[in-house]
């Protein structure tokens, strides 16, 4: 329906917290440099014009659009071209290419600081003597350092941190309390920004096709009792939700992920039968439970796919008669069948089964040529089987720090050209799949791993289409969004590369490294390891593991020396020389 | 929406031919293979021939082979079936069909052989 006022409406439907929230975000979203203050002086009189617009629908502008409220407040800022360069030509478009405009302005990989977490007391005071401030704070310096997070996910995570700190500052020993739930929900938070950034790259490069077929197998595996109409409304408006957000629609956005919400709560019967604990909770909390609810127990009678779908006459018949209907019909009824398949394998097959009918179909005797397709599908399933089973007893041999070093190593090979940094945080990442899915339920992995990798990978991807330097991971990268994985797994050690000479300061450490936290320290090393295959790239496992052990054995002596920088100054040329000597 | 309008059917005596066309829209007629079926009265559906998306392929059932000769022209997304030496046993409404499909969604064209 028309509302006079949009901003009238999503006022009311959202209430003042939450309406504040997401306008915080969009504008720290869209303009990553401006500081907290900045922000939140616009979005105070932005709530304060949607306040007289509440009062009075007819009043003066309250019937312009969100995009030219918002775009027209944030090309207001002083000196927008001294800090945003190019960026600042937007503000001489008209909407909707404006906003077009700030959406390819943002960087995913913001020149900020680390968001660094200050000491338990010092957040403890802070946030009890404004709590509003202190949330207001959290929501901009995550939202301009990851500006695709989910909107309304990131008010679930904020209001987590709030409820941790209210619990926390209470304790005597607020640190231990803090510390631990505090990087639970970074943790959390972390991967639900590559998971959300990777929808959002489905949806701008391949449109709102591609990312309804990941709702439609996403949905069919969590809800196998749904029919395929109500699977097929719930991906339609999934994708509606997703498309907001990604396009920085964000109070549009959470209005129609909390429609959604209660449309699925008020539909349990049709659509499955764990709902219920989620639909219990307060809104933030049931939109975040419902994202994640465990897979529905599956209809006991199930006919085998073949039946419709390839000993059926009717294939082709069906097919063209209805393509896409045809291809969501197949794609629900085998996600269904596959909880324990990841969502990125399914659409492979889906592909591969329209590929079969676009070839067969085309023949003389389609049903001879279709009939075998359900065996091509065996290798395209064996692949990501292998590669969660090597990956895996990989990972239960050296623990999460030892499985980052062996990707580390392994993708450095494979793309040289890749800045260190990017490859050292792309392997902390991957490695830390093992941790995330390898300690599941054999039915479980599958789909875990290769669904977070995607979502690393697709990280990795946009790294580098800042600054493209490996023809390999352009390869990979310029492919389908469910390719990527394969693609990278297939690499191998890229012949083209002409090592980096050595570089003996690469490898000089100083006593500063012995008070680094251990996070810090294994970067540090990491970059290293990463320096060291740059140089010889056809170096053995074991001379890495030589050359790696060495390393740790002269941080630790230096570092327990009374003398530490005599130590990492005489020690050090040593270790490099031993180095070259074991590499050559 | 997907459309076959069959046409060209009628009433011919023994050893004469009949040309039948199908007009189809609403797909992507040189993407899919074609075929003939066929139903005589008060018996079940018989497949009579195919033919693939170019036109490069033709398929015939025993009872068809050297009478009947499928063909298409996809620039005017139409299918034919020139049938020579017709039977009193051709008697039958003939449709085509997209892919191996057996079972028309159109209302068939009616040929009758008789003397």
């Known amino acids: 329906e028309a509302h006079k006022s949009e901003i009238a409406h999503r006022y009311n439907d959202l209430g003042e917290q939450h309406f504040k929230g997401l306008v915080l975000i969009a504008f720290s979203q869209y303009l990553q440099k401006c500081s907290y203050d900045e922000h939140a002086k616009l979005v105070q009189e932005v709530t304060d014009f949607a306040k007289t617009c509440v009062a009075d629908e007819s009043a003066a502008n309250c019937d312009k659009s969100l995009h030219t409220l918002f775009g027209d407040k944030l090309c207001a800022i002083p000196n927008l071209r001294e800090n945003y360069g190019e960026l600042a030509d937007c503000c001489t478009k008209q909407e909707p290419e404006r906003n077009e405009c700030f959406l390819q302005h943002k960087d995913d990989n913001p020149s900020l600081p680390p968001f660094e977490r200050p000491e338990a007391e010092a957040m403890c005071t802070s946030f009890k003597e404004n709590p509003t401030t202190f949330m207001g704070h959290y929501l901009h310096e995550v939202a301009r350092r990851h500006p695709y997070f989910y909107a309304p996910e990131l008010l679930y995570y904020a209001e987590q941190y709030n409820e941790i700190l209210t619990q926390c500052c209470a304790e005597a020993d607020k640190e231990s309390c803090l510390t631990p739930k505090l990087d639970g929900v970074k943790e959390k938070a972390l991967v639900s920004s590559v998971r959300q950034r990777m929808k959002c790259s489905s949806m701008q490069k391949f449109g709102e096709r591609a990312f309804k077929a990941w709702a439609v197998a996403r949905l069919s595996q969590t809800f196998p009792n749904a029919d395929f109409a109500e699977i097929t409304k719930l991906a339609t408006d999934l994708t509606k939700v997703n498309k907001e957000c990604c396009h920085g629609d964000l109070l549009e956005c959470a209005d129609d992920r909390a429609e959604l919400a209660k449309y699925m709560c008020e539909n349990q019967a049709t659509i499955s039968s764990k709902l219920q604990t989620c639909c219990d909770k307060p809104l933030l909390k049931k939109a975040h439970c419902l994202s994640e609810v465990e897979h529905d127990t599956m209809p006991a009678d199930l006919p085998a796919i073949a039946a419709d779908f390839v000993e059926d006459q009717e294939v082709c018949k069906n097919y063209a008669e209805a393509k896409d209907v045809f291809l969501g019909t197949f794609l629900y009824e085998y996600s269904r069948r596959h909880p324990d398949y990841s969502v990125s394998l399914l659409l492979r097959l889906a592909k591969k089964y329209e590929a079969t009918l676009e070839k067969c179909c085309a023949e003389a005797n389609p049903p001879a040529c279709y009939g075998t397709v359900l065996a091509e599908f065996q290798p395209l399933v064996e692949e990501p089987k292998n590669l969660v089973k090597t990956n895996c007893d990989l990972y239960e041999k050296l623990g999460e720090y030892g499985f980052q070093n062996a990707i580390l190593v392994r993708y450095t090979q494979k793309a040289p050209q890749v800045s260190t940094p990017t490859l050292v945080e792309a392997a902390r990442n991957l490695g830390r799949v093992g941790t995330k899915c390898c300690t599941l339920p054999e039915d479980q992995r599958l789909p875990c791993v290769e669904d977070y990798l995607s979502a690393i990978l697709n990280r990795v991807c946009l790294l580098h289409e800042k600054t493209p330097v490996s023809e390999h991971v352009t390869k990979c990268c310029s492919g389908s969004l469910v390719e990527r994985r394969p693609c990278f797994s297939a690499l191998t050690v890229d012949e083209t590369y002409v090592p980096k000479e050595f570089k003996a300061e690469t490898f000089t450490f100083h006593s500063d490294i012995c008070t680094l936290p251990e996070k810090e320290k294994q970067i540090k090393k990491q970059t290293a390891l990463a320096e060291l295959v740059k140089h010889k790239p056809k170096a053995t496992a074991e001379q890495l593991k030589t050359v790696m052990d060495d390393f740790a054995q002269f941080l630790d002596t230096c570092c327990k020396a009374a003398d530490k920088d005599t130590c990492f100054s005489t020690e050090g040329p040593n270790l490099v020389t031993r180095c070259k000597d074991a590499l050559a | 929406k997907v459309q076959l309008v069959e046409s060209g059917g009628g009433l011919v005596q023994p050893g004469n031919s009949l040309r039948l066309s199908c007009a189809a829209s609403?797909?992507?007629?040189?993407?899919?293979?074609m075929s003939w079926v066929r139903q005589a009265p008060g018996k079940g559906l018989e497949w009579v021939s195919s033919?693939?998306?170019?036109?490069?392929?033709?398929l015939y059932a025993d009872s068809a082979k050297g009478r009947f000769t499928i063909s298409r022209d996809n620039a005017k997304t139409t299918l034919y079936l020139q049938m020579n030496s017709l039977r009193a046993e051709d008697t039958a409404v003939y449709y085509c069909t997209i892919g191996g499909s057996l079972s028309p969604s159109s209302q068939g064209t009616l040929v009758t052989v008789s003397s």
């Open positions: 033919i693939s998306g170019s036109g490069s392929d033709a």
């Open positions: 609403g797909f992507t007629f040189s993407s899919f293979g």
